[in-house]
Amino acid sequence: MAVTACQGLGFVVSLIGIAGIIAATCMDQWSTQDLYNNPVTAVFNYQGLWRSCVRESSGFTECRGYFTLLGLPAMLQAVRALMIVGIVLGAIGLLVSIFALKCIRIGSMEDSAKANMTLTSGIMFIVSGLCAIAGVSVFANMLVTNFWMSTANMYTGMGGMVQTVQTRYTFGAALFVGWVAGGLTLIGGVMMCIACRGLAPEETNYKAVSYHASGHSVAYKPGGFKASTGFGSNTKNKKIYDGGARTEDEVQSYPSKHDYV
């Protein structure tokens, strides 16, 4: 029950996160005009990944797309790429996780397959969240750098006679949406990975016999673990995912309640 809840919650959290990443990517307010000493402005500038906008105080808003690809800063292109990769991975992760949900029965899908799919989607969510966080952080860093550069030469004089105020940009709403969404996707992914451990079936229901060889302390269990030689087939026991890699001695140190000598 706890596993189902963890998996379901992980799915919902990731879904919200990915929706947020999509929203952030589409938003125009990645950077907004800094109203440092002028809280009320007649012309307000803000920029997104795809277009820049100007909102006039009279109500008129005009947005212009970045119709050039080669003329854009490499950093902006990198942020776009990170956000798109995050969305694509997240979308695939969502698709995979739908089929992996324990509460949904699809034909005769085995728990081991669901566990694998849960783990796959979890990893995808984690990478998706990291991509979004990285993208937003790169953009934020770019803004901070530009902010201090424009502060250094805030007023560029024309022969010392006329002042031209340089527009400074600060963090827009999309950055915060992106950070939160990326974090949620990451958390959702971790939850899916945790749920995956619980989805892995218990040790085989068949009684496993331990054969103790005279000079060795190795337990041979049919299907208990996959030997590197390829023996110990899993087809009947449905045991694919093991909580972690363990040595043969470690396996022997955790005997099943069905073991007998």
């Epitope: 005009q33 002028n38 009320v40 402005t41 007649a42 012309v43 500038n45 803000y46 920029q47 820049s52 906008c53 100007v54 006039e56 105080s57 009279s58 109500g59 008129f60 005009e62 212009r64 006329v162 002042q163 031209t164 105020v165 340089q166 527009t167």
Partner: antibody
Amino acid sequence: QVQLQESGPGLVKPSETLSLTCTVSGYSITSNYAWNWIRQPPGKGLEWIGYINYSGNTNYNPSLKSRVTISRDTSKNQFSLKLSSVTAADTAVYYCATSYYGNSFIYWGQGTLVTVSS
Amino acid sequence: DIVMTQSPDSLAVSLGERATINCKSSQSLLNSGNQKNYLAWYQQKPGQPPKLLIYWASTRESGVPDRFSGSGSGTDFTLTISSLQAEDVAVYYCQQAYSFPWTFGQGTKVEIK
């Protein structure tokens, strides 16, 4: 077509409050645009007083801010100007106007002359 | 406040001749976000409210004859009437809309010589 019409008393006594109303037809004042008041003393230039925009936010000329209030009545599709403690220097033709693209004044009322005199 | 200074104060031009009015602002009116200059030109005839001719320094308002044109960027702007007509006799004002409070030039009176 947006039409604006100013109305109010043509004569106001010094130290009293000047009150004018602009009735808008052909457009809802809550849809878009900023709704401005501009004045022009006889034989002189234009001075922007302030505005109330479609969302109800106001902005005033700092030189008049302490004396000016611009409000609106959405049910009547009107906006109003109140200028307190008037003096003879406030004698002018008062225009209501709509600003939009480029923050430029695209539609104007015919104007109403307000004289401040005892 | 941004101060708008128009020159000349009055201008007498023969019918069919070119009339040029200048407007200078104390600060740049160019917005970096859209590369537009927030300057408008108005025409006011006696007893009438002003009429918008040009906005964004060079965009002609619909219905305005094409003999009216605006140019300039930053702090220096020009309104040109390419061929003066009798109905163009009026006072012309420039207005900055980039920074509050919005301010007007003192006006230029255009007459027929």
